[in-house]
Interface confidence: medium
């Protein structure tokens, strides 16, 4: 499939104007690459009549002109003073010869359309109202109005002043005079249908006295505006209605033959197909509102139409507007992983793409709520608070220059199951869409912390544990502590690493912090994880209480936010507590031989305390054993 | 949810010139447009100055030459300076965000209160 689009048919009458616009994908070379409008003939051969190198053909020779709008990666083909002649099949598109990459344009000039001397024409869009206006002379003040349609040549009374009217006009035509006006009546349709299109005539009396006018009516189907996405990226389509219908149900929905499918309305219908990647926003009280589709797909391409009604469906005669859209599949937005799986009580990283070139933007996580028009709360940004209900267990990690960020939740639950959209407040295009599935654990997770009920005590050394299994053993762990904007990385040690590389004794491998001394402010959620250069993987946190030892006290925890992910019993808390004392008098003394050979190196006392946020992994590997 | 506020309004004389200024708050998330409109007494609003997102400016015809918009997005602040003031130039200026908020990241229309300028000898 070529990935030009434009307009498909084009009509016009002779004498007027169109204008083509043609649409190509946003690359440097397509932005430079030569532009060009042909004609189809029966031999196949393309003739070139217009191209952004400066030619022009002898017939468009003052009436066309070829521009290029390289901001928006289209460029148009104005053409004036059209006829009959140049109604036929053309091309519109890029390359050095006319055989590149194109679209085909079929163009309609028909004759100037013929009515009755004294013809009003009154041109209107489907589901509009038209006001006819009736002229008559004095002597028929107080005679019968009436309008007719004309049906060959026949008249077939639509309504008059007796109160008849047609069935088919029932509800919608009605026949009035304004103030004391004596020489004009006026008649309104409302709703208006294709099948509406056609020549009336009102007339005031009977007979040879009769005063008669002619009114022409053309219906028009809405002119479907072109929109061009790249695969993966979004679209927002923006309807507006009129305040006329500002009070009724609005819909989207997608051209399928005949019929017109709802994708999303406001009575909360919804398209199981744009479930977790669909938003419709009211835009104000005029009846004005916006449908966002994030991770477009190849399907989502074609016909689309917003409209209003009571019963949220498209309904005949009522206001509409139109689209085609067109998902360019050459894109520039990565391929990401559109379904993460994990499970409770685990982990996972998210990796949400943006463009490169926006590097500076603000990045934004958010969960897509399935209410009546979809919503999507942000949960956490690069200047965002975490959400309640997330703290200690989501951190958004940036990673300037190279066009992705990482979204981190752990202690998953299965009630975190849903869609969740990577936005940026620059390109809206790279809005993504991930569907996170968490189904419940059936083994013990990768990564442990010992140990589990974890209380430090102000002024004394805290050393707390995370096993990990071999598969990680090349990988590199670290230890952060989690604050409201992000995760910050901690200075820790490896003892896995200094295993043999050869076999890999599942039961040594560890990574350890140590805070000392403990301060007040060591309080908080921390977490140990792994990752290799900017690919995060699995975490795990536990929440560090720290109090103050008052002497005879027994040691007991306070009510444990660990809970949360380990719904322990207390009387496990109790006893972990017991062994947590037990660990501090077994720690391996070499810890602190190795710590202190670091702060003798030169680095500062207060950067080997654990809380001295080393802020990169650069801190953590620098004393990592 | 969001508030738009105006300020600087005033009576000046012909040929004067003030400077409008409005600042979105609240929880945004993303502000698309902010455009400047004016309403004078029995007529509709009409739309004065627009500054895009990407940087770019549009003005009214009635205002080329003589009005100028800025805006700052760190600050999500707009204005509006207005030079060779008219008396045709007497209404109430309104500003006009598009605002994708924290809790839906697609886009609606807010308003200000609208600040009064007077052109007036």
């Known amino acids: 499939q070529s990935p030009i689009f434009g307009p498909q048919d084009v009509s016009s009458i002779e004498g007027n104007s169109v204008s083509i616009t043609c649409y190509y994908p946003d690359t440097s070379v397509n932005r430079h690459t030569r532009k060009y409008w042909c004609r189809q003939g029966a031999n196949g051969y393309c003739a070139t009549l217009i191209s952004s190198n400066g030619y022009l053909s002898k017939e468009y020779s003052g009436r066309a002109s070829l521009i290029n709008f390289p901001e928006n990666s289209t460029f148009v083909i104005n053409i004036a003073h059209l006829t009959q002649e140049d109604t036929g099949s053309y091309k519109c598109g890029l390359g050095t010869t006319n055989r590149g990459l194109f679209f085909d344009v079929s163009l309609e000039v028909s004759q100037v359309p013929e009515f009755p001397n004294d013809t009003h024409v009154y041109t209107k869009d489907i589901g509009r109202t038209v006001t006819i206006e009736c002229r008559f002379k004095e002597g028929n003040a107080h005679s019968k109005k009436s309008l007719c349609k004309k049906r060959g040549e026949a008249c077939e009374v639509v309504i008059d002043s007796t109160e008849y009217v047609d069935p088919s006009y029932k509800d919608r035509a009605i026949l009035f005079m304004k103030g004391t006006s004596r020489d004009i009546f006026y008649v309104n349709i409302s709703h208006l249908i294709p099948s509406d299109a056609g020549l009336y005539v009102c007339q005031a009396g009977e007979g040879p006295s009769a005063d008669k006018n002619n009114a022409d009516l053309q219906v028009l189907e809405p002119e479907p505006e072109l929109l061009y996405k790249d695969l993966r990226s979004s679209v927002t389509f923006e309807c507006d209605l009129g305040r006329e219908v500002a009070n009724d149900a609005k819909y989207l929905c997608r051209k399928n033959k005949e019929t017109c499918d709802v994708i999303i309305n406001t009575l909360g219908k919804r398209d199981p197909a744009f479930e977790g990647r669909i938003l419709l926003t009211p835009r104000d009280d005029n009846g004005r509102f916006s449908v966002l589709i994030t991770g477009l797909r190849k399907e989502d391409a074609g016909h689309y139409q917003c409209g209003a009604h009571s019963s949220g469906l498209p309904q005949e005669g009522w206001p509409v507007q139109a689209w085609q859209l067109f998902v360019n599949e050459e894109s520039t937005i990565p391929n990401s992983r559109s379904v993460v799986k994990g499970v409770t009580g685990g982990s996972v990283a998210i990796v949400c793409p943006y463009n490169p070139k926006e590097s500076s933007s603000l990045k934004y996580w958010c969960h897509w709520e399935a209410d009546e028009n979809g919503r999507c709360p942000v949960l956490v940004g690069t200047q965002a608070l975490v959400q309640e209900g997330y703290e200690g267990r989501l951190a958004l990690f940036d990673q300037p220059g190279s066009g992705a960020y990482t979204v981190i939740l752990n202690q998953l639950t299965t009630q975190d199951s849903g869609f969740y959209w990577c936005l940026t407040d620059g390109d809206s295009r790279w809005r993504t869409t991930i569907e996170l599935q968490v189904a419940e654990a059936t083994k013990k997770p990768d990564l442990e912390v010992t140990p589990q009920n974890a209380t430090a005590v102000i002024g004394e050394t805290f050393t707390i544990s995370c096993h990990y299994p071999c598969k990680f053993y090349s990988q590199e762990k670290y230890w952060c502590k989690w604050s409201n904007d992000g995760c910050h990385i901690l200075p820790s040690h490896d003892e896995g690493a200094r295993q043999s590389s050869v076999s890999c004794d599942q039961s040594s491998q560890i990574v350890s912090m140590t805070l000392n001394p403990v301060k007040k402010e060591d309080e908080g959620w921390y977490w140990c994880g792994v990752k290799e250069g900017q690919v995060y993987g699995e975490t795990t946190a536990i929440y560090v209480a720290v109090e103050e030892r008052t002497r005879g006290s027994p040691h007991i925890n306070p009510t444990d936010a660990n809970a949360r992910a380990k719904d322990a019993p207390e009387e496990e808390a109790m006893e972990s507590s017991v062994r947590e004392d037990e660990n501090k008098a077994n720690l391996d003394p070499r810890l602190f031989a190795d710590e202190r050979e670091i702060q003798n190196a030169g680095d500062q006392a207060q950067e080997n305390r654990a809380s001295g946020n080393a802020g990169s992994a650069g801190g953590q590997s620098g004393s990592s054993k | 949810q969001v508030q738009l506020v105006e300020s600087g309004g005033g009576l000046v004389q012909p040929g004067g010139r003030l400077r409008l200024s409005c600042a979105a708050s609240?929880?945004?998330?993303?502000?698309?447009?902010m455009a400047w409109y004016r309403q004078a007494p029995g007529k509709q609003r009409e739309w004065v100055a627009i500054?895009?997102?990407?940087?770019?400016?549009h003005y009214a015809d009635s205002v080329k030459g003589r009005f100028t918009i800025s805006r700052d997005n760190a600050k999500n602040t707009v204005y509006l300076q207005m030079n060779t003031l008219e008396p045709e130039d007497t209404a109430a200026y309104y500003c006009n965000a598009e605002v994708a908020t924290m809790i839906q990241p697609g886009f609606r229309d807010y308003w200000g209160q609208g600040t009064q300028v007077t052109v007036s000898s």
């Open positions: 609240g929880s945004i998330f993303s502000i698309r447009d």
């Open positions: 500054a895009a997102r990407g940087g770019s400016t």
